[in-house]
Interface confidence: low
């Protein structure tokens, strides 16, 4: 049914934004409203994506390019081309099947998306904890204990044994 494209094929002359209309002697017809063709020589204009509900329009559809969506405030994009919108959480939380949950002790999340990650274990680098970690912030590692002046002390918490992506429910 689909003919092979050749120099004799009149469809090859149809630019982006049009389609080759078999019903009208293969003339190039403009894409109807709410449709587009992003390349020349097309026999169809694809229907524009509509950004609805939790999606909002980042770029309007034109006759030559599809609409692009992003997410309304309180949500963020996931997947190629923002195929999904996922709920934001607060810093210091992660999204679980039961909603936003605080990071458990020894972990942090400094973004509104993603999972809680373990604090850096300063001692692995031979350093000490300069600033303690919180749910929202990683620890800040300082000089190694040997570099500290006599009498100074630092606290290095044990590294939490925790599988990423899991919170206490």
């Amino acid at each position: 049914f689909e003919r092979t494209r050749s120099l004799q094929d009149p469809c090859s002359n149809c630019p982006a934004g049009t389609f080759c209309d078999n019903n009208r002697n293969q003339i190039c017809s403009p894409c109807p409203p709410n449709s587009f063709s992003s390349a020349g020589g097309q026999r169809t204009c694809d229907i524009c994506r509509q950004c609805k509900g939790v999606f909002r329009t980042r770029k309007e559809c034109s006759s030559t390019s599809n609409a692009e969506c992003d997410c309304t405030p309180g949500f963020h994009c996931l997947g190629a081309g923002c195929s999904m919108c996922e709920q934001d959480c607060k810093q210091g939380q992660e999204l679980t099947k039961k909603g936003c949950k605080d990071c458990c002790f020894g972990t942090f999340n400094d973004q509104k998306r993603g999972i809680c990650r373990p604090w850096t274990n300063c001692s692995l680098d031979g350093k000490s904890v300069l600033v303690n970690g919180t749910k929202e912030r990683d620890v800040v590692c300082g000089p190694s204990p040997a570099d500290l002046s006599p009498g100074a002390s630092s606290v290095t918490p044990p590294a939490p044994a925790r599988e990423p992506g899991h919170s206490p429910q």
Epitope: C11, D21, N22, C31, T44, I47
Partner: nanobody, 123 residues
Framework: QVQLQESGGGLVQAGDSLRLSCAAS????????MAWFRQAPGKEREFIGR????????DYADSVKGRFTISRDNPKNTLYLQMNNLKPEDTAVYYC???????????????????WGQGTQVT
Amino acid sequence: QVQLQESGGGLVQAGDSLRLSCAASGWAFDNYGMAWFRQAPGKEREFIGRLAWNGGSTDYADSVKGRFTISRDNPKNTLYLQMNNLKPEDTAVYYCARQRSYSGYGIRTPQTYDYWGQGTQVT
């Protein structure tokens, strides 16, 4: 996933009326044009009519023009086919289909439609 389910078919007499429904699920129904086709035993699938995504434009086959009317209820994700003054030659399995694109093959050809229901029999 995308699903289309026709209902409302049955056994009727010549001159009767019947309304078919097509319930859609799994996608943004109001983004797409929709069509009805039918297929009688031993015959090719035949275009009946098509309704634009917003209900703004319609196209009907000559064989049903003036007797059949397509409508849609976007909030209910449902397409309808109102059939009046039925004739013996209207006996067929009736299918609804989702329009994938504006196609150079034309809106009356099956190639322009990507998802189809299972069909409902009208006798």
